[in-house]
């Protein structure tokens, strides 16, 4: 079994700062296709009172809108409740706060359950280093390699980053 970096040793505060989205995966491909509800891109994160606050970039009408979301802590380790396009059980599946973060969400919307995973990195130049870990985690939680979309610079709302 590989190392299980599922919780930042120094607490959630270590996740604060800038992040870059690298890859998405879902069992419902429409969710992560262009204009899909979960084809969104991380800009930055912060933590307060055990909750995670994220600024995400959402492509809209040829531009990218920055939206702030809060994922609230629960009584389960590394699990948060997030309201975004329905209810999401958001899990920190694997974390190395200085390098990469893999999120896993179980989305429930209109009696439909979907899975979405998200790989983000601190340094885009190292994104290839963490794709194998993302593929492994995806397989482990029930997503397949062919359900992964690796994002390009054009996808990521790079022009919207301050």
């Amino acid at each position: 079994q590989e190392g299980n970096h599922e919780e930042p040793q120094g607490g959630l505060e270590e996740l604060s700062g800038r992040w870059h989205s690298v890859a998405l995966a879902s069992n419902k491909s429409d969710l992560i296709k262009p204009w899909g509800h979960f084809r969104v891109f991380i800009h930055s994160m912060s933590a307060k009172d055990g909750n995670l606050h994220g600024d995400i970039l959402i492509p809209q009408d040829g531009q990218c809108e920055k939206v702030s979301l809060t994922a609230f802590k629960t009584a389960t380790s590394n699990k948060f409740d997030l309201e975004y396009w329905g209810h999401n059980d958001l899990y920190l599946a694997e974390v190395d706060p200085k390098s990469y973060l893999i999120l896993y969400m179980i989305n429930q919307y209109n009696d439909d359950t979907s899975l979405v995973a998200h790989l983000m990195v601190r340094d885009l130049s190292r994104q290839q280093d963490f794709l194998p870990a993302f593929e492994s985690v995806c397989e482990d939680i029930g997503l397949h390699k062919d359900q992964i979309v690796v994002l390009s610079d054009d996808d990521r709302c790079q022009g919207s980053r301050d």
Partner: nanobody, 124 residues
Framework: AVQLVDSGGGLVQPGGSLRLSCAAS????????MGWFRQALGKEREFVAA????????NYADSVKGRFTISRDNAKNTVYLQMNSLKPEDTAIYYC?????????????????WGQGTQVTVSS
């Protein structure tokens, strides 16, 4: 579906340890996410711990984190719950659960096979 048989429960003093086992038969065990839940008398079923297919991803209830460890041996078709520093409030029937669709974490609705349960009593 997979069949699950829980074992390892018993009476233990506060501060003691137990290891629960859940043996699976049926489909390939490595396809299954596994979870442990518990239910104390007169209370609702409560999440304890869960493991993804290889154990790469795990989650724990805050109330047991640092005391309980979930692990699995896919070669032996078995998932374990090592329980240390047991407290009277850990007294309950413990159930293992499995699902071959995806990792459902702490939500019992996302598990479609359940064991019969094993009683754990922590008392002096």
């Amino acid at each position: 579906a997979v069949q699950l048989v829980d074992s390892g429960g018993g009476l233990v003093q506060p501060g003691g340890s137990l290891r629960l086992s859940c043996a699976a038969s049926g489909r390939t065990f490595s396809y299954y996410a596994m979870g442990w839940f518990r239910q104390a008398l007169g209370k609702e079923r409560e999440f304890v711990a869960a493991s993804s297919r290889t154990g790469r991803v795990t989650n724990y209830a805050d109330s047991v984190k640092g005391r309980f460890t979930i692990s699995r041996d896919n070669a032996k078709n078995t998932v374990y719950l090592q329980m240390n520093s047991l407290k009277p409030e850990d007294t309950a029937i413990y159930y293992c659960a499995a699902d071959d669709r995806f990792y459902g974490g702490d939500n019992p609705a996302f598990y479609n096979s359940w064991g019969q349960g094993t009683q754990v009593t922590v008392s002096s």
